[in-house]
Interface confidence: low
């Protein structure tokens, strides 16, 4: 009778992560009697995957009933495959021995390759906000994919970006890989509503790439422009001065009126109007009683935006032409919607 051969018909098997791998193995003879075992890898460091005789292997099922005396099919199924399961699997026939079974013959091995989808790309922007015209870096990371070949693209509002660098790690063989890319984006004043998109294409995605996004609203700071104007006189000896705070983002903004360098009122912008580009406008006004001033008044609108150093715009109010009203000591009346007390 011909000597038993262990046949592994598949040189390689490709399985998607999460699926079940079938590793085929047959023997050409029932003799000698003895169990089979499956190993990953060869040599002294090989890893036991399945032992027909003993042990608990919850992820492994046999294709046929190995307890049948005439069974020569030793194929197994390994469930819930992950990239860590990649490797070469050997079906090994043992013959009965005393006290231990003795390895008799091994199959040629089947290489299991795992196709693992990349994780959803995570896009992260700079830790601190930046202003228009500045270049900021965005990173995109995706992990756990196999095989190594992968394509990554960057877009801003649908337009493909070209200024980026991408690395796939590790460089050598691995069960799975990671990709890391850094793109440089120049901010514009219109970017509050903009999005940066990182798109990853991989063989496992069947033409439907994964995308990660970052909203530039979390990255951009659009500093306000200030305009201080004197409105027509509302009443005798009273002048209404407005400070238009335009095109700022984010909303957190604090405005202080100063009269000749002295703080008159501080407000926080809470009721703002939103522009089409996502920036905000706000207006504060000050009613100045000119009769309380003997000299010209320098009115300053000072704005602290998003924790940045204050910017200001001043307006010189000429009071010499106005008649003095005796007994008045109120220099400014608080007409703003948001009051802040100071001093």
């Amino acid at each position: 009778e011909e000597e038993l051969q262990v046949i592994q018909p598949d040189k390689s098997v490709l399985v998607a992560a999460g699926e079940t791998a079938t590793l085929r193995c047959t023997a050409t003879s029932l003799i000698p009697v003895g169990p089979i075992q499956w190993f990953r890898g060869a040599g002294p460091g090989r890893e036991l995957i399945y032992n027909q005789k003993e042990g608990h292997f919850p992820r492994v099922t046999t294709v046929s009933d190995l307890t049948k005396r005439n069974n020569m099919d030793f194929s197994i199924r390994i469930g819930n495959i992950t990239p860590a399961d990649a490797g070469t699997y050997y079906c090994v026939k043992f013959r009965k021995g005393s006290p231990d079974d003795v390895e008799f013959k091994s199959g040629a091995g089947t290489e299991l390759s795992v196709r693992a989808k990349p994780s959803a790309p995570v896009v992260s922007g700079p830790a601190a906000r930046a202003t228009p015209q500045h270049t900021v870096s965005f990173t995109c990371e995706s992990h756990g994919f196999s095989p190594r070949d992968i394509t990554l693209k960057w877009f801003k509002n649908g337009n493909e970006l070209s200024d980026f660098q991408t690395n796939v790690d590790p460089v050598g063989e691995s069960v799975s890989y990671s990709i890391h890319s850094t793109a440089k984006v120049v901010l514009t004043r219109e970017d509050v509503h903009s999005q940066v998109i990182c798109e990853v294409a991989h063989v496992t995605l069947q033409g439907d790439p994964l995308r990660g996004t970052a909203n530039l609203s979390e990255t951009i700071r659009v500093p306000p422009t200030l305009e201080v104007t004197q409105q027509p006189v509302r009443a005798e000896n009273q002048v209404n001065v407005t400070c238009q705070v335009r095109k700022f983002y984010p909303q957190r903004l604090q405005l202080t009126w100063l009269e000749n360098g002295n703080v008159s009122r501080t407000e926080t912008a809470s009721t703002v109007t939103e522009n089409k580009d996502g920036t905000y406008n706000w207006m504060s006004w000050l009613l100045v009683n000119v009769s309380a001033h003997r000299d010209d008044v320098k009115l300053t609108c000072q704005v602290e935006h998003d924790g940045q150093p204050a910017v200001s715009k001043s307006h010189d109010l000429k009071v010499s032409a106005h008649p003095k009203e005796q007994g008045s000591n109120t220099a400014a009346e608080n007409t703003g919607s948001n009051e802040r007390n100071i001093y």
């Epitope: 809470s270 924790g307 007390n341």
Partner: antibody, heavy 122, light 107 residues
């Protein structure tokens, strides 16, 4: 770790003065706005005063305006509250507290001291 | 000044109960609202900032919501260690103002 320790409380007669101190450690004191908040016995919390990191912005509650003065010494990592013309209604536990974000105020109070008791009574 | 009206002023609930506290501002304060916990004899502790953000290290059973004038603070499953007084605080304008507090007790 971040810590605030108040001191200077005590018993004082109406019309008298006290100076509270708050020693800060574990963070860059000069970068953070600071607050004083008080709590009368059995009552709720009442904000008293705030000072920005560089002294440029100071705020007071109407109830203490003109009587209390907040100040800070960034070199000594210390916050102060000078209380003059004290009244019975100023009796409270006084807490100092720091802002969560550096160089900016209006986010709240993320670290508090243990409080120091001020009693105004004749 | 912006008034903060907190309700109820006190409540008693069983361990595991869902507890809800409301806070109403006298004018629009956007999301500039914080929630604090104060245990007897202790300093207040920041739990929620900007209406709905959980401060680092605070258990996830605490949550906050709301914007404008109406805000809600929730303890999804009351624990014995949650016995305390809870305060809302507006930071939209100076003077900073607190709600009157809600004392939470265990039945």
């Amino acid at each position: 770790q971040v810590q605030l320790v108040e001191s200077g409380g005590g018993l004082v007669k109406p019309g008298g003065s006290l100076r509270l101190s708050c020693a800060a450690s574990g963070f860059t004191f000069s970068s953070y706005s600071m607050h004083w908040v008080r709590q009368a016995p059995g009552k709720g919390l009442e904000w008293v005063s705030s000072i920005s990191s560089s002294d440029s912005w100071i705020y007071y509650a109407d109830s203490v305006k003109g009587r209390f003065t907040i100040s800070r010494d960034n070199a000594k990592n210390s916050l102060y509250l000078q209380m003059n013309s004290l009244r019975a209604e100023d009796t409270a536990v006084y807490y100092c507290a720091k802002e969560p974000r550096s160089y900016w105020h209006g986010y709240g109070m993320d670290v508090w001291g243990q409080g120091t008791t001020v009693t105004v009574s004749s | 000044d912006i008034q903060m009206t907190q309700s109820p002023s006190s409540l008693s609930a069983s361990v595991g109960d869902r507890v809800t506290i409301t806070c109403q501002a006298s004018q629009d304060i956007s999301n500039y609202l914080n929630w604090y916990q104060q245990k007897p004899g202790k300093a207040p502790k920041l739990l929620i900032y900007d209406a709905s953000n959980l401060e680092t290290g605070v258990p996830s059973r605490f949550s906050g919501s709301g914007s404008g004038t109406d805000f809600t603070f929730t303890i999804s499953s009351l624990q014995p260690e949650d016995i305390a007084t809870y305060y809302c605080q507006q930071l939209s304008n100076y003077p900073i103002t607190f709600g009157g507090g809600t004392k939470v007790e265990i039945k």
